[in-house]
Interface confidence: low
């Protein structure tokens, strides 16, 4: 009769994670007499899966009935499979001895691979905003996934960037893998509703790449843009002086209104419009009182936007044409502005 | 060897319901998408959307969206195509035909196809 | 969507010739781009993908070529079980789209 063998007919056997992997083992023969352990890995270091003879192993079942006499498969499957259950795994079968049983045979082994999902990408921006024409950077992670082939891409609204530099870790063999980007953004003055995308995908995701997304708007500043106008006059000794704030993101803003220097009111934008480009408009106005002014008035319009140095816009009232009102020490109505533009 | 079997012709009236199955054999049946594309006759081949058979998500494209259905019977290795409300237009054959994951060298490419069922649509 | 648009509807030809059947893309697909040879009757069968890579068991005289939006598939030293349905689809984006197809019949 011919010596038994030991078949493992499956070189590998790939499994996604929390599935369960089937691992198969014929023997030709009933004799010798011994029982079949199963093994991951080779040599002294390996671990002990599963053993017919003994033992607890609450993930194994075996696929037919070990207990029959003329049971000949050695099939076994391990359920809720992790990136960490990859490796060889070895049928063997021992002959039976005193005291101790004797390994006699060992299958070719069956390679386990584990496909695992890449975790949602996380993609996070520069910690502080940046202005249109700087170049920022964004950074892209997904972990988790096996086996390691990954493909990421960058897009700005549906545009596939190129500047952007892509590690996996670890460089050798590992249970699972991480994937870490950081691609540049050179920012424009649109970009206010702007996204920025990451995409990984995988073999494990079947043409549905997962994306990781970022808004540009928590990246961007656009400063504003200031203009100082007198408007036509209201009354024989008021004149009205407008500051329009515009295309300014986000909308933190204060303004400061000078008179020759002195300040003469300081206002929060509050009720903005907002351009298609999802950038602000505001308008702040101011009364002076003409007759309250021997010589011209320089007024200054001062914006402090999203907590960076003032940029402010000057304008130079003539006050000579107009009738001076002796006793009048007010010089500007402390008039709010609540106004609306539409550009 | 690789094999996708698909379900019978079938003959409807409008406004019924029809089920195509599509059974996969000789590959692991969660390591590819399983897509649907319609040829009507004297019509381009066209893309209907694809069900991941790893997550069961399905994937229509546009044209496709409201009276179709893709669903799995993965335990059978096996993939559904249902239409409701069917319409004289629905008339066609309807093919199965896998791709590998998106990652893979030859991504979107369909290696391998059913038989095709033959859907036609008549009062 | 992109349109693939095999320009010629049908190719004549002759036993032991060479032909070659064209699919241009409305825009880039890079090399995301397969080939199917269909049959009356039957399903598509396929021959190429990534523009040039012939599949396992497809004969070496079908060759595919070509990147962007300009492709080819040639066929050297045709036989009669070549005549048949030749279709070309993109798959760099989604929907995934096909060629109206190109019929290779005898002169």
């Known amino acids: 009769e011919e010596e038994l063998q030991v078949i493992q007919p499956d070189k590998s056997v790939l499994v996604a994670a929390g599935e369960t992997a089937t691992l198969r083992c014929t023997a030709t023969s009933l004799i010798p007499v011994g029982p079949i352990q199963w093994f991951r890995g080779a040599g002294p270091g390996r671990e002990l899966i599963y053993n017919q003879k003994e033992g607890h192993f609450p993930r194994v079942t075996t696929v037919s009935d070990l207990t029959k006499r003329n049971n000949m498969d050695f099939s076994i499957r391990i359920g809720n499979i992790t990136p960490a259950d990859a490796g060889t795994y070895y049928c063997v079968k021992f002959r039976k001895g005193s005291p101790d049983d004797v390994e006699f045979k060992s299958g070719a082994g069956t390679e386990l691979s584990v496909r695992a999902k890449p975790s949602a990408p996380v993609v996070s921006g520069p910690a502080a905003r940046a202005t249109p024409q700087h170049t920022v950077s964004f950074t892209c992670e997904s972990h988790g996934f096996s086996p390691r082939d990954i493909t990421l891409k960058w897009f700005k609204n549906g545009n596939e960037l190129s500047d952007f530099q892509t590690n996996v870790d670890p460089v050798g063999e590992s249970v699972s893998y991480s994937i870490h980007s950081t691609a540049k953004v050179v920012l424009t003055r649109e970009d206010v509703h702007s996204q920025v995308i990451c995409e990984v995908a995988h073999v494990t995701l079947q043409g549905d790449p997962l994306r990781g997304t970022a808004n540009l708007s928590e990246t961007i500043r656009v400063p504003p843009t200031l203009e100082v106008t007198q408007q036509p006059v209201r009354a024989e000794n008021q004149v009205n002086v407008t500051c329009q704030v515009r295309k300014f993101y986000p909308q933190r803003l204060q303004l400061t209104w000078l008179e020759n220097g002195n300040v003469s009111r300081t206002e929060t934008a509050s009720t903005v419009t907002e351009n298609k480009d999802g950038t602000y408009n505001w308008m702040s106005w101011l009364l002076v009182n003409v007759s309250a002014h021997r010589d011209d008035v320089k007024l200054t319009c001062q914006v402090e936007h999203d907590g960076q140095p003032a940029v402010s816009k000057s304008h130079d009232l003539k006050v000579s044409a107009h009738p001076k009102e002796q006793g009048s020490n007010t010089a500007a109505e402390n008039t709010g502005s609540n106004e609306r533009n539409i550009y | 060897q690789i094999q996708l079997v698909q379900s019978g012709p079938e003959l409807r009236k409008p406004g019924e319901t029809v089920k195509i199955s599509c059974k996969a054999s000789?590959?692991?049946?969660?390591?590819?998408?399983m897509n649907w594309v319609k040829q009507a006759p004297g019509k381009v081949l066209k893309w209907m959307g694809f069900?991941?058979?790893?997550?069961?998500?399905?994937t229509y494209a546009d044209d496709f969206k409201g009276r179709f259905a893709f669903s799995l019977e993965t335990s059978a290795s096996t993939a559904y195509l249902q239409i409701n409300n069917l319409k004289n237009e629905d008339t066609a054959t309807y093919f199965c035909?896998?791709?590998?994951?998106?990652?893979?060298?030859?991504?979107?490419?369909?290696?391998?196809w059913g038989q095709g069922t033959s859907l036609t649509v008549s009062s | 969507d992109i349109v693939m648009t095999q320009s010629q509807k049908f190719m004549s030809t002759s036993i032991g010739d060479r032909v070659s059947v064209t699919c241009k893309a409305s825009?880039?697909?890079?090399?995301?781009l397969a080939w199917y040879q269909q049959k009356p009757g039957q399903s598509p069968k396929a021959l190429i993908f990534?523009?040039?890579y012939r599949y396992i068991g497809v004969p070496d005289r079908f060759t595919g070529s070509g990147s962007g939006t300009d492709f080819t598939l040639t066929i050297t030293n045709v036989q009669s079980e070549d005549l048949a349905e030749y279709f070309c689809?993109?798959?760099?984006?989604?929907?995934?789209?096909f060629g109206a197809g190109t019929k290779l019949e005898l002169k």
């Open positions: 990534s523009a040039s």
């Open positions: 069900i991941n058979t790893y997550t069961g998500e399905p």
């Open positions: 689809q993109q798959y760099n984006t989604y929907p995934l789209t």
């Open positions: 035909t896998r791709t590998r994951g998106y990652y893979d060298f030859d991504g979107g490419a369909f290696d391998y």
């Open positions: 825009q880039n697909v890079g090399t995301h």
């Open positions: 000789g590959y692991s049946f969660t390591n590819y998408a």
